[in-house]
Each structure stands twice: as C-alpha cells, then as structure tokens.
C-alpha cells in the first residue's frame, strides 16, 4: 500500500458497548475526523478466532450489493457520521464490533476504529424472582399498555369504594332523587360479553346552587342530598341503592355527564 | 508493487471442474479489498464472473457452478467453475477492486483457458 | 442485465488524428446519489486490461490529458484528441450501477 500522503485521520466507533434486547435494533455511530474525497466505509465484526467478518461496505451513499440487509449503514447529515444498525437484533449478534476506512487512490490509506461490544440480552416481560437486579426496561408500548390497564382497575376499584361506601355508611334517602332513563344502548365489548350497564346520574336540582358556593356547615346535614343509581332495564325500587356486585362493568361518569357521586 | 498471477490447466474436458488459483505477492489477501474473477471470451466483451471479499458474490450467470475462496494464510484466491463446456473457453483474469464496482486497481496477467475433448 | 452497445468495433486511424468511441447503456447509469457510474478500459495487445476512466469523466492517475470521457444517462463517449502509437488496441465500456456488472464488446483501435 501506498505511504500516506494524507493527515491520520482517526475514526471513532461509539457507544464502546451497547446493550439491546432480541429483536430490537442495535446502532453504533462510526464517525470520520474529516471527509475525504473518495473513500470506503466497511463494518466489521470480530470472529471468535480473533479475524475481522465484513458486514457491510458503503461507498457514495451506496451499500454493496448482496449483502445480509438485517446490516444497514446509513450516512448522517452531517457527512462525517454513519449510524450502523443491526435491524432486529439476534442473541448471537452479541459480540465486538468496528468499523473500517479505506481511503481511495491515488493514495490509499486504511484505517480501522476501537471496538466496541454488543450484548443482545433475552427479551423478558417480567424479572426474574430471585434476581435482585432491576428489572429490564420495558420498550414504549409495554409500558404504556402497564400503565393503562393499571389507571382503568385504579378507577374502577375507586368507583366501587366509593359506591360501597356511599351505601354503606348513608341512610336510604329517596327524597329529591329523580329516576331518569337513558335511551343509549348498554355497551357491548364483544359477541361474549355480559351485558354492561351504564349508570345513569338523574339532573338534580338545587335552589342552593344560585348563590355563590359556601365551605358546608359540619352541622348541616340537610344542606346534603345524594343521586340514587338507578340501572336501565330492571325493576328499580324508589329506595333502591347500588351494591359493590351491581356495578360490574360500570363506567365512571364523564364530565358531561353531570352530577356524579359526589355529596351535592 | 502489488502483483496477481493466475495458475492452472490449459486445457479442460467438457463436463470437468476448470481449477484455477491466483497467486498475490507484494500485499495481502484480505477482506478489505475486492478479489474478483473477470474472464475475456473469444470476439467477445470482459465478463465479471464474481468476488470475495470475506464473503463471496456471483454473476447470476455463474450462479451454481461457480465457487471463488480465498485462503488468508497462502495469500492466494481461487476459483472452481464446474459443468464446462466449450462456451467457456477464454482468458481468465484474477483482478484485484478497492471497492465492489469495477474500481479495478490490478490486474493478473490472465491465463488461456480451452475446453475441448 | 445492463447491456453495454460499443460504436464503432474497429477503428483505424491516423497518428495526430481525432478518435471517439461511442457507448450506449440499454438503461440510466446515474445513481440516485448523483454519480454517474460509466468506467473505459483499455487493452493494450498483449496485456491486461487498465482503466482509464471512472465514472464518465475522471481520468486515472497516469492517463494522459488527451483522453477524455464525456455523457450522462445511457450515451457515453470516450475522446482521444491526438492519437499515438502507444493509443492502440482495444477499448471497452463498463458499468457499476447495477449488479452484475457488464462491459461493451469492445472497440478495437489500430493506427494507419
């Protein structure tokens, strides 16, 4: 090979080690000090027997034809920077990884960058029982689907608190309370679901309301009336109060809904 | 100076593997460079037969009667063309790319190759 | 494939005359990153082939001024100003645009 005629120009290959689980994507950045001309980019892998595989090869904004395309190289904007990805990693892609320079004649020059380690872990929903190190961080859509099954039984178990306790702890009071029905349709989760019923908050109507809303007296009980439930489509009793097992599929009041559970 | 020398038979019979080797002096085999075989029919164009480069890559012309290897260690490539018949007769070249298109930097000196019974 | 159309096949011609070699590719050898990749080799009698130029335009280092390549897309044309009795044999065009890569069948170029 030609003696350089060219500054050193060293390469860089980062992160120095990387930790990705099966199936997602793995990406190193290996960046030039400058832009030559004309050059190669090749990405290696070390075998076990210490030889340099060859991955990938880019050159103009190209890759080499016929290659393994789980292999990516992608140049950056900034025309120094390429992003190296392996496109659903495998448990055995764990290994050390580099990437190579071949700057083109007239006066050729190879150059090679650190390495750097891969490690592509097993994917896991769950830590194991005995293992004291934290769990696995969970990708975006398992945590966001962890979340929101967790807010809706939050919710519910709130909903069916607060109606136990509502039942439980206050006399029946029927006066005021105004048994209204609903023309929607009960809600329908699929061809098996048990019928749901939605709970139907009656408009109350209070002269107190007009004036300008006062911090409740501690004795003044008769300033405070409760909304009844009352269920769509079976027998209500004027006294009738909801219990914990009647509320199955119950959906918690929206705003428009009016008045909710709350004492008035 | 880098230098390719190809070696092999002369003469192969119909049907026969065609064994040839190319010999590198001056550099390394390796799998930074492209290390093809380019073979010159009689009254017809280069044809590019395939590469190695770590890995090997094949005209689909070529495509299941070609093997092209490499050994590091004796510094020299080689290639297996099996099923011969006498349209393969020609010049075979060893040819050295700095990248996978024809960026050819050197080449053998080519070696005859006919096919005939 | 690409198939590679070389005109004229045989060229005789005068020491200090002009000469030039048509090429034509049967699709577009312009790459979405803007090269147009269109490679002449020659075959000096006797030897190997050497490439004289890399993709339409650039002459390899060593290859005098008097050559020239010239095109874009499918039509390509390789230009000698001034021939010279070391200019002789044959001239092929190449692509590497696309996989497999093809060459012309040749021009061959003999001085008077």
């Known amino acids: 090979l030609d003696s350089p005629d060219r500054p050193w120009s060293p390469l860089t290959f980062s992160p120095a080690q990387l930790t990705v689980q099966e199936g997602e994507n793995a990406t190193f950045t290996c960046s030039l000090a400058d832009i030559p001309d004309s050059f190669v980019l090749n990405w290696y892998r070390l075998s076990p027997r210490n030889q340099t595989d060859k991955l990938a090869a880019f050159q103009e904004d190209r890759i080499e034809p016929g290659r393994d395309r789980r292999f990516r190289v992608t140049r950056l904007p900034n025309g120094r920077d390429f992003h190296m990805s392996i496109v659903a990693a495998r448990l055995n892609d764990s290994g050390i990884y580099l990437c190579g320079a071949i700057y083109l004649p007239p006066n050729t020059q190879i150059n090679e960058s650190p390495r750097a380690e891969l490690s592509v872990t097993e994917r896991t929903l769950e830590p194991p029982t005995q293992s004291p190190s934290p769990p696995p961080r969970l990708s975006g859509q398992l945590q966001g689907l962890v979340i929101g099954v967790t807010s809706v039984l939050v919710g519910v178990l709130l909903l069916l608190l607060l109606t136990w306790v509502l039942a439980a702890v206050f006399p029946r009071a029927t006066r005021g309370a105004c048994v209204c029905g609903s023309e929607d349709e009960p809600l329908k989760e699929g061809p098996d679901a048990a019928p749901v019923f939605t709970l139907d908050y009656g408009e109350l109507d209070f002269q107190w309301r007009e004036k300008t809303p006062e911090p409740p007296a501690p004795c003044a009980p008769e300033q405070t009336e409760y909304a009844t439930i009352v269920f769509p489509g079976r027998p209500a009793s004027p006294g009738r109060r909801a219990s914990a097992s009647s509320l199955q599929g119950a959906q918690p009041p929206s705003p428009e809904d009016g008045p909710g559970l709350w004492p008035l | 100076e880098l230098t390719l020398q190809e070696s092999g038979p002369g003469l192969v019979k119909p049907s026969q593997t065609l064994s040839l080797t190319c010999v590198v002096s001056?550099?390394?085999?390796?799998?930074?460079?492209?290390w093809n075989w380019i073979r010159q029919r009689p009254k017809r164009g280069l044809e590019w037969m395939g590469y190695w480069s770590g890995y090997t890559h094949y005209n689909p012309a070529f495509q299941g009667r070609l093997s092209i290897d490499a050994d590091t260690a004796q510094n020299h490539f080689s290639l297996q063309l099996s099923s011969m018949t006498t349209e393969d007769t020609a010049v075979y070249y060893c040819?050295?790319?700095?990248?996978?298109?024809?960026?050819?930097?050197?080449w053998g000196q080519g070696i005859l190759v006919t096919v005939s019974s | 494939d690409i198939v590679m159309t070389q005109t004229p096949l045989s060229l005789s011609v005068s020491p200090g005359e002009p000469a030039s070699i048509a090429c034509k590719a049967s699709?577009?050898?312009?790459?979405?990153?803007?090269?147009?990749?269109l490679y002449w080799f020659r075959q000096k009698p006797g030897q190997s082939p050497q490439r004289l130029i890399y993709?339409?335009?650039n002459r390899d280092p060593g290859v005098p001024d008097r050559f020239s390549g010239s095109g874009s897309g499918t039509d390509f044309t390789l230009r000698i100003t001034r021939v010279e009795a070391d200019d002789a044999g044959v001239y092929y065009c190449?692509?590497?645009?696309?996989?497999?890569?093809?060459f012309g069948e040749g021009t061959k170029v003999e001085l008077k």
């Open positions: 699709q577009s050898l312009l790459h979405s990153n803007g090269n147009t990749y």
């Open positions: 190449g692509q590497g645009i696309q996989d497999p890569w093809t």
């Open positions: 993709k339409v335009s």
């Open positions: 040819v050295r790319g700095y990248i996978w298109t024809p960026d050819y930097d050197y």
């Open positions: 001056g550099g390394s085999v390796t799998n930074i460079f492209y």
